[in-house]
Interface confidence: low
Amino acid sequence: DSSKWVFEHPETLYAWEGACVWIPCTYRALDGDLESFILFHNPEYNKNTSKFDGTRLYESTKDGKVPSEQKRVQFLGDKNKNCTLSIHPVHLNDSGQLGLRMESKTEKWMERIHLNVSERPFPPHIQLPPEIQESQEVTLTCLLNFSCYGYPIQLQWLLEGVPMRQAAVTSTSLTIKSVFTRSELKFSPQWSHHGKIVTCQLQDADGKFLSNDTVQLNVKHTPKLEIKVTPSDAIVREGDSVTMTCEVSSSNPEYTTVSWLKDGTSLKKQNTFTLNLREVTKDQSGKYCCQVSNDVGPGRSEEVFLQVQYA
């Protein structure tokens, strides 16, 4: 009864020419131990012979003799639990279906595993949180659907082409559920990181470049402002005029409102980027700043201390 065979392994494994593939696999045949195992490449059932045709990558034989391929392809499993496989090195033409032909005393089974081998190392994938806000710690994740015991790799983070100083945590999974290498970087972006390019670079054990993925940082931040005053020393006599200008050096998203504050209190009807004070009086002395808001919140400029002296 073929329904007795239960297998667990990743559905598809990914690798590239010259690397290797490690296939974690468990199985169960209720009627006893495995008696024969053949690993096929792209097996096809032949109705005439009632057997499978295809390239035999590995074959267990009574006398222990094995095809030459077996140096490259290893069955690392056991008689009734483990069907782990290793192909090292793996080649482009290994792509396709691997067929695990298992036979016990009374049962037979063909289990299929997909193998996707690319010509060159495929790029990792950077995953960012849905929103990044300035000064809030985020985790950048770089995921590569590859891991193999015989082919060590490393993932390196770069910001504008320069290695990032923060310590990344790299983890690998080689389980029946998933095969991957992942690097996680905790990072507190500043507003100045907005628009900058982050790269996750795949390297071999010697640090040689294999592939990469890049993303542009979208750092949400309050408006960043500069205030300019004429005269520049902000010291005037009563009756003089003063002009203050608010410049937005950066805002993400776009700003929505502008206001001016004197000594922390909002000045009514002053909602433009220029504050014109004509014929100033002594009581207009104080600390002035502009405030510009966006969906993240308000941003304030530095304060300018206006000193109005008697004429």
Epitope: S60, L76, N80
Partner: antibody, heavy 120, light 112 residues
Framework: EVQLVESGGGLVQPGGSLRLSCAAS????????MNWVRQAPGKGLEWVGR????????NYSGKFKGRFTISADTSKNTAYLQMNSLRAEDTAVYYC?????????????WGQGTLVTVSS | DIQMTQSPSSLSASVGDRVTITCRSS???????????LEWYQQKPGKAPKLLIY???NRFSGVPSRFSGSGSGTDFTLTISSLQPEDFATYYC?????????FGQGTKVEIK
């Protein structure tokens, strides 16, 4: 350090029952077969059976099927040998032994043994 | 069941002697996955057995190089190239290729 410690042995009357325990530590208990092997006084070793704690799969030597039952509790990292309808010829030191390799299959770690004496 | 027959049942030897113990199975113990699960264990009085050799000829970690295993099919040999005082013990062969797994009856190595 991988360790196996048997317990539960002792004197039992013919026809009686006894449950032996094998407490494992220092490795992933559920992922290795656990075997029971016995040795009658002055005699050789005899394989009783085994269990795969991960899913409870068992195999027995034919002569013990029916009377002996092997079980495991993964929450306690312990394997058991339940022995029923005991006879004088079941008097022996009972060892548990781990299959230490997934494919090479050898008993790399043994318990110290526990003596079962069946006598009236 | 597969019978494992060891010879001799006992032997007397001196320190420095070369000792050979043979084990014959009643049928082939080559598992059809290609391996022969033939092991050798050493047991001293009142102690649990210790693994020496697995898969016919592979020395287990920590086992001195004076112990070696060989053979194929149904005939297997354990050789101690130069017997040491601590080697006086009983030696068992074991097959783990077919159920039920079976041990040989043992070979006791005594001091001459």
């Amino acid at each position: 350090e991988v360790q196996l410690v048997e317990s539960g042995g002792g004197l039992v009357q013919p026809g009686g029952s006894l449950r032996l325990s094998c407490a494992a530590s220092g490795y992933e208990f559920s992922r290795s077969w656990m075997n029971w092997v016995r040795q009658a006084p002055g005699k050789g070793l005899e394989w009783v059976g085994r269990i795969y704690p991960g899913d409870g799969d068992t195999n027995y030597s034919g002569k013990f099927k029916g009377r002996f039952t092997i079980s495991a509790d993964t929450s306690k990292n312990t394997a058991y040998l339940q022995m029923n309808s005991l006879r004088a010829e079941d008097t022996a030191v009972y060892y548990c032994a781990r299959d230490g390799s997934s494919w090479d299959w050898y008993f790399d770690v043994w318990g110290q043994g526990t003596l079962v004496t069946v006598s009236s | 069941d597969i019978q494992m027959t060891q010879s001799p049942s006992s032997l007397s030897a001196s320190v420095g002697d070369r000792v050979t113990i043979t084990c014959r199975s009643s049928q082939s113990i080559v598992h059809s996955v290609g391996n022969t699960f033939l092991e050798w264990y050493q047991q001293k009085p009142g102690k649990a057995p210790k693994l020496l050799i697995y898969k016919v000829s592979n020395r287990f970690s920590g086992v001195p190089s004076r112990f070696s295993g060989s053979g194929s099919g149904t005939d297997f040999t354990l050789t101690i190239s130069s017997l040491q005082p601590e080697d006086f013990a009983t030696y068992y062969c074991f097959q783990g290729s077919q159920f039920p797994y079976t041990f040989g009856q043992g070979t006791k190595v005594e001091i001459k």
